[in-house]
Interface confidence: low
């Protein structure tokens, strides 16, 4: 995981795979790490536009395609501090990226397994 430099307020955006470069069909995990208490609501922004997702500190992008490429950041909203935006990270989808082990495979038992 890469820890992007965070502002003094302590919000960091972690990206896996390292460098944000992933092969088509791979999975990207973005984690918004905030030191605030209580944990604030976290929303996500892609290329400057809010993503229509429920608040969550973890953004999972499974089976990525080129439409998932872009610049991502997270915004943490705390009632007493207002919104804080993380440094952005760039996600690139390329054949030379890290596809990682297969996830969500279904074995002979019929049970889905975590890779």
């Amino acid at each position: 995981r890469v820890r992007e430099p965070g502002p003094p307020e302590g919000i960091q955006l972690l990206v896996e795979p390292e460098g944000g470069i992933v092969a088509p069909g791979g999975t990207v995990t973005l984690t918004c790490a905030i030191s605030a208490q209580p944990p604030p609501q976290v929303h996500w922004i892609k290329d400057g536009a809010p993503l229509p997702l429920a608040p969550s500190p973890v953004l999972l992008l499974p089976e990525v395609g080129h439409e998932d490429e872009g610049t991502y950041s997270c915004v943490a909203t705390h009632p007493s501090h207002g919104p804080q935006e993380s440094p952005p990270v760039s996600i690139r989808v390329t054949e030379t990226g890290d596809e990682g082990p297969a996830e969500g495979s279904v074995g002979e038992s019929g049970l889905g397994t975590l890779a």
Epitope: E16, L60, E103, G104, V106, G112, L114
Partner: nanobody
């Protein structure tokens, strides 16, 4: 119909430990993450921790260093080891399984009460 069966809650004194378990009762495909959430009386449900398909874990700041998430891939099970429990950890704990292309599964919840 798949159900998530939770166990392991209960009453514990501050500073004590509990281990929560959550297992799928049927066939579950396309899992890409598992996690735990909690809801205290009169409050919104809040995220606690997540483990992704590649084993990446993350924790809410309030539990980091005290709680540990783990999984058993063969059983489609996820666990939450809770140490050094505090009264503010009192809540109903829910497990969640995220599936690629499907709505997530939620457990029925298990009560954890930490007395001072």
């Amino acid at each position: 119909q798949v159900q998530l069966v939770q166990s392991g809650g209960g009453l514990v004194q501050a500073g004590g430990s509990l281990r929560l378990s959550c297992a799928a009762s049927g066939s579950v495909s396309s899992i890409y993450a598992m996690g735990w959430y909690r809801q205290a009386p009169g409050k919104q449900r809040e995220w606690v921790t997540t483990i992704t398909g590649r084993g990446i874990t993350d924790y809410a700041a309030s539990v980091k260093g005290r709680f540990t998430i783990s999984r058993d891939t063969a059983k489609n099970a996820v666990y939450l080891q809770m140490n050094n429990l505090k009264p503010e950890d009192t809540a109903r704990y829910y497990c969640k399984i995220d599936r690629r292309g499907y709505a997530p599964y939620w457990g029925q919840g298990t009560q954890v009460t930490v007395s001072s």
